[in-house]
Interface confidence: low
């Protein structure tokens, strides 16, 4: 079964290398367990950045991942990726799986292009 996953097309990371964006799905289902995976697409390969499972009791995710955090509310996940550098610029896709109870639903967003600009080094100053 399919669900529609929406995410912003472009996000600019902060100067500290932090990018935040929402990942929403519809239609909303009464689901006990929602699996959210952030994937990075490079050429024809997908690489998992982080993944977590949200439940009614567990609405804060990605505890296993130092660079990812997220909160879940109804059919919206607010995702934050930290520690980004210019080389991490790329397309990040949000995959949502409604794991339980059956039926299984799955959907993939079109991706969020995250742009990361490394901060200019502070010039030396004489005091």
């Amino acid at each position: 079964e399919a669900i529609q996953v929406t995410q912003p097309s472009v996000v600019l990371a902060s100067s500290h290398g932090v990018a935040s964006f929402p990942c929403e799905y519809s239609p909303s289902h009464n689901t006990d367990e929602v699996r959210v995976t952030v994937l990075r697409q490079t050429n024809d390969q997908m690489t998992e950045v982080c993944a977590t499972t949200f439940t009614e009791k567990n609405t804060v995710g990605f505890l296993d991942y130092p660079f990812c955090s997220g909160t879940f509310n109804e059919s919206r996940v607010n995702l934050t990726i930290q520690g980004l550098r210019a080389v991490d610029t790329g397309l990040y896709l949000c995959k949502v799986e409604l794991m339980y109870p059956p039926p299984y639903f799955v959907g993939m967003g079109n991706g969020t292009q995250i742009y990361v600009i490394d901060p200019e080094p502070c010039p030396d100053s004489d005091f």
Epitope: D32, M46, E97, Y100
Partner: antibody, heavy 116, light 111 residues
Framework: QIQLQESGPGLVNPSQSLSLSCSVT?????????WNWIRQFPGQKVEWMGF???????YYNPSIKSRISITRDTSKNQFFLQVNSVTTEDTATYYC?????????WGQGTMVTVSS | DIMMTQSPSSLSVSAGEKATISCKSS????????????LNWYLQKPGQSPKLLIY?????HTGVPDRFRGSGTDFTLTISSVQDEDLAFYYC?????????FGAGTKVEIK
């Protein structure tokens, strides 16, 4: 850090029951995922046996469904495997594993020999 | 049950060379909604438990080196430049349907 640890007798007599436990640390087994038992026979063949879901439902491999039971103790964050009427064909290394489609965390395995 | 057939059963490769392992399923593993195949790859080093390498046929699990590559079309696992530490058994596994089933495994040896 999530860890799974199997424990149980290394030797079981034919026709008896085999009981194994899996202790999970770093994640509550009632918070999510399926909690699985998988075994690997001496010839390296791997067989998925079944799981208990985080909310308590179970699903077993039909090939051994009549002989196995998977239960849990949420207060100890453990889940268990019982295999009845064992034969020498049940000699294997038994693993517990966490699953959401794929098995991302495994225990180190416990070797069980069925022999008289 | 879905049968998973792996080939070859063993493979001997020199360090730095490419290794390719094939997995065939007795029926389609493609989920049209997910637009992906429900196939996973694991490696098992001597004396250790299996470890997840790739899921959805081509998505590398966190921390897996990019020399490991899964094809989403023909179910092959390629190690682009084999390292000594890649000595292991490799297994494919389907989760398209219950019961989950594994291939018989491919033993990769280093020459």
């Amino acid at each position: 850090q999530i860890q799974l640890q199997e424990s149980g007798p290394g030797l079981v007599n034919p026709s008896q029951s085999l009981s194994l436990s899996c202790s999970v640390t770093g994640y509550s087994i009632t918070s999510g995922y399926g909690w699985n038992w998988i075994r690997q026979f001496p010839g390296q063949k791997v067989e998925w046996m079944g799981f208990i879901y985080y909310e308590g439902s179970t699903y077993y491999n039909p090939s051994i469904k009549s002989r196995i039971s998977i239960t849990r103790d949420t207060s100890k964050n453990q889940f268990f495997l019982q295999v009845n009427s064992v034969t020498t064909e049940d000699t294997a290394t038994y693993y517990c594993a966490r699953q959401t489609g794929y098995f991302d965390y495994w225990g180190q395995g416990t070797m069980v020999t069925v022999s008289s | 049950d879905i049968m998973m057939t792996q080939s070859p059963s063993s493979l001997s490769v020199s360090a730095g060379e490419k290794a390719t392992i094939s997995c065939k399923s007795s029926q389609s593993l493609f989920n049209s909604n997910a637009k992906t195949n429900y196939l996973n790859w694991y490696l098992q080093k001597p004396g250790q438990s299996p470890k997840l390498l790739i899921y959805y046929a081509s998505t590398r699990h966190t921390g897996v080196p990019d020399r490991f590559r899964g094809s989403g079309t023909d179910f092959t696992l390629t190690i682009s430049s084999v390292q000594d530490e890649d000595l292991a058994f490799y297994y494919c596994q389907q989760w398209y349907d219950y019961p989950y089933t594994f291939g018989a495994g491919t033993k990769v040896e280093i020459k």
